[in-house]
Structures are given as structure tokens and as C-alpha cells.
Interface confidence: low
């Protein structure tokens, strides 16, 4: 899997798993978000060679064709597979309240 | 959705479903395929600004992070949503054979 | 001045209950959180859980849920920690405390030790 | 379950500075909140948000957070300050969560 244990263990210049620290006020402007300050969000990014974790056979077709036709636009992109939710604080009013935001951490990548 | 109606109808640098006919002898170099020669694959591509067609929270805090930091790396992708079968004939040997391949045609697009 | 005064202290049997009381004032009860902490003898500080006493919504530590209840009167500005059945494992200092905003605790009672002896 | 780390023991001599640290994993997206505990006393908030300062906590006491740890700072060291120290913040699901706590010895 394109995940932490690989990505962040290897030099990999294909779609991979990259760090990426958000701070929620400084990165997002987001003030309303009292826990956590930010959190570890991750990103998908790198080359999509033809096999190379391929999503599905529309993937593998468009790797191939972009091999065979590389000045081609058309090529699959490195983006998200797995992800996690993450557990906020934030106020309405004095009122704290704590939610469980989704898909808010990548875990792992795919090309697609 | 980012479909055919909409994608093929307007002109549009952002993320979008764009026409893609592939010869399967000629793009990839299949020649087992004896039906179709070719198929309308499409594939999706454009720029993904914040709140285009998001995926999830992460794809809305990666392309608002871009923004804010836009000398950043770390930005959504445009990649398909929504994927049709097609339906192909081969032979094995002297036999024909009628076999359904899965996820062969991009039918919308979303930022990821 | 805002102050937190707890019940005094408990000797009690293993499998008896108890309950133990925090009185606020010097503030508006129902605008601030009340936290229970645990020190046992000698140890440090755990964090058991907390409640709202505005709208009685509780959020409990893993390792205290279902062991002890916690629970306020807004009428009278008093939260509670009980336990239906105690063991001599839950022989400790036990502090109430406000927390202010979120996560930290501003102000705390002075402690009620309750000690599980058979 | 999520830990926080703190070192057994600190000492420091009379008018130096003294420097208390408090790993974990999550520490650098949460915030810390330091307590200060006297034998036989309720804790006294010192520090609350990484590093701001309650009313009436003197200016000898700071907080900072780099990566995955907090520090509390107390410069210019009185034998007053002689306590134990405890960290707090929080685990991902937002659960309170205590360091072990650190003795300060001030010497001299």
C-alpha cells in the first residue's frame, strides 16, 4: 500500500503518500477550530507509470495509453485511497462542542 | 455533476470530464480485442480551486490550503467519479467469448 | 471570588456506594464545565471525565467509563462523582475542578480523600 | 493508550532557570497546559495554552512547544517554586490526558 509505512521509508518519486502538517488558523484561516491547533493531513503526489497502484482498469488503460502516446494530456493523477476522520473542538458560543470531521486524514494513495 | 452535459457543452479550464476515444490496437497496442476497435474512455482533467466538485473535507482543506499557500505542492487532482463497463469480444482460440471489462468509461469527474 | 468546596472526607468498605459532592460559586454554574481528577497515594494526576452542568452532557476517560457516574444539580450549583459498589483500588484524593473554556482547569476544590478499607 | 512523558526529577540551583519538558505523539497539534501541585495542595493552573500565563502567575513561568514537545520554563528560580509539575493535553479523541509529573528540587 502507498502508505505511511512505504512512502515515508522510501525515496519515491511515483504517487506516493508525502507529509503535510496543516496549522488550522496560519494555513486555513480557520479560527473557529479550538482543538487541535492542526493536525497531520498528508497529501498524494508523484508520477503515475503504467501498474503503478492503479485505481481501476480505466486507470491502467489511460497509464498505457500515456506511455504509448506520452505527449498525451490524458494521464491518471495520484490522489487519496484511504482516509480518516479527525475529532475537533469548537465553540457555539460558550458552548464547546467536540465532532468527528471525515475524511480529513490520507492514509494511503492510488492512482486514478 | 462534472459529466458529459455539462463538461462538453461549456468551456472549462476546471476540473471537467474531456473526450478521449481510444483504438485499442493503435493507443495500447491490444490486439486480443476483436470488438470494439476502439471505445469512447473519456478522462478528466483541469484545475481543482477551492470548492470545486470536492470529494471530501480533505480535497476542501487541500485546495484551500493551495490557495492560501499556493507555491505549495500539495494540491487536488482532477480524477474520475462516476465509471461505466464496456462490454468487449475476444476470441480463445477458435471461440468467441462476450466478456464485460469493469470501470472502462469515465462518466463524471471530481476534485480528489 | 469563585471557589469549589468539596464534601469532607470518606471512609467507607469495599462493595459500599458513595458519592461526593463539588458546590460552586462566586460564578455562573451552568456556563463552565466541573472535571473530576484522581490522585491516588503518592501518584499522579488522572483525568476521569467531566460534565456540563447547564445540560447534564457528560464525557467520560476510557479508563473510568462504567466505573463511577458523574452527575450535577444546577439548581444548586453541585456536581457529583458516585460509585454503586467501591473497591480498595479506588482509594485516592479526588479533586474537582472548572474548566474554563476547554481544556484547561482554572480553578480546583480542595480535595476529598476517600479511602476503601475493609 | 496515549502517554504523555515527563521526566522523574528536575533540579535547579536558587536563581537559575529550570526547564520541564512533556513528550507525546500528539503534542504538536494540541495544546499543553501546565499544573504546579505543593504537598497535601490542590494543583494551581501556571500554564494554559502552550504559553499563556493565568492572572496572578509570575512572569518567571513560560510555556513553548516545538514538534512533539511542550516545555514549562521557570527562570530565575525561588524555593517557592519547589513542586511537582504535571503536563496536560490530549489524546485524538480529544481526551484529557495527565504527564506523570515532575518533581523540581531548587537547590541551595
Known amino acids: 500500500a502507498l502508505d505511511a509505512a512505504y512512502c515515508f521509508r522510501n525515496v519515491q518519486d511515483n504517487c506516493c503518500l508525502r507529509p503535510l502538517y496543516i496549522d488550522f488558523k496560519r494555513d486555513l484561516g480557520w479560527k473557529w477550530i479550538h482543538e487541535p491547533k492542526g493536525y497531520n493531513a498528508n497529501f498524494c503526489a508523484g508520477a503515475c507509470p503504467y501498474l503503478w497502484s492503479s485505481d481501476t482498469q480505466h486507470t491502467k488503460v489511460l497509464s498505457l495509453y500515456n506511455t504509448i502516446n506520452p505527449e498525451a494530456s490524458a494521464s491518471p493523477c495520484c490522489v487519496s485511497q484511504d482516509l480518516e476522520p479527525l475529532t475537533i473542538l469548537y465553540y457555539i458560543g460558550n458552548t464547546p462542542k467536540i465532532e468527528q470531521l471525515s475524511n480529513m486524514i490520507v492514509k494511503s494513495c492510488k492512482c486514478s | 455533476a462534472l459529466d458529459a452535459a455539462y463538461c462538453f457543452r461549456n468551456v472549462q479550464d476546471n476540473c471537467c470530464l474531456r473526450p478521449l476515444y481510444i483504438d485499442f490496437k493503435r493507443d495500447l497496442g491490444w490486439k486480443w480485442i476483436h470488438e470494439p476497435k476502439g471505445y469512447n474512455a473519456n478522462f478528466c482533467a483541469g484545475a481543482c480551486p477551492y470548492l470545486w466538485s470536492s470529494d471530501t473535507q480533505h480535497t476542501k482543506v487541500l485546495s484551500l490550503y493551495n490557495t492560501i499557500n499556493p507555491e505549495a505542492s500539495a494540491s487536488p487532482c482532477c480524477v474520475s467519479q462516476d465509471l461505466e463497463p464496456l462490454t468487449i469480444l475476444y476470441y480463445i482460440g477458435n471461440t468467441p467469448k462476450i466478456e464485460q471489462l469493469s470501470n472502462m468509461i469515465v462518466k463524471s469527474c471530481k476534485c480528489s | 471570588q469563585v471557589q469549589l468546596v468539596q464534601s469532607g472526607a470518606e471512609v467507607k468498605k469495599p462493595g459500599e456506594s458513595l458519592k461526593i459532592s463539588c458546590k460552586g460559586s462566586?460564578?455562573?454554574?451552568?456556563?463552565?464545565?466541573v472535571a473530576w481528577v484522581r490522585q491516588m497515594p503518592g501518584k499522579g494526576l488522572e483525568w476521569m471525565g467531566w460534565i456540563d452542568p447547564g445540560q447534564s452532557n457528560t464525557r467520560y476517560s476510557p479508563s473510568f467509563q462504567g466505573q463511577v457516574t458523574i452527575s450535577a444539580d444546577k439548581s444548586i450549583s453541585t456536581a457529583y462523582l458516585q460509585w454503586s459498589s467501591l473497591k480498595a483500588s479506588d482509594t485516592a484524593m479526588y479533586y474537582c475542578?472548572?474548566?474554563?473554556?476547554?481544556?484547561?482547569?482554572?480553578?480546583w476544590g480542595q480535595g476529598t480523600l476517600v479511602t476503601v478499607s475493609s | 493508550s496515549y502517554e504523555l512523558t515527563q521526566p522523574l526529577s528536575v533540579s535547579v540551583a536558587l536563581g537559575q532557570t529550570a526547564r520541564i519538558t512533556c513528550s507525546g505523539d500528539n503534542l504538536g497539534g494540541y495544546y499543553a497546559h501546565w499544573y504546579q501541585q505543593k504537598p497535601g495542595q490542590a494543583p494551581v493552573l501556571v500554564i494554559y495554552?502552550?504559553?499563556d500565563r493565568p492572572s496572578g502567575i509570575p512572569e518567571r513561568f513560560s510555556g513553548s512547544n516545538s514538534g512533539n514537545t511542550a516545555t514549562l520554563t521557570i527562570s530565575r528560580a525561588q524555593a517557592g517554586d519547589e513542586a511537582d509539575y504535571y503536563c496536560?493535553?490530549?489524546?485524538?479523541?480529544?481526551?484529557?490526558?495527565f504527564g506523570g509529573g515532575t518533581k523540581l528540587t531548587v537547590l541551595g
Open positions: 475542578a472548572r474548566m474554563l473554556a476547554w481544556g484547561w482547569f482554572d480553578y
Open positions: 496536560a493535553s490530549y489524546d485524538s479523541s480529544l481526551m484529557m490526558v
Open positions: 495554552d502552550t504559553s
Open positions: 462566586g460564578y455562573s454554574f451552568t456556563r463552565y464545565y
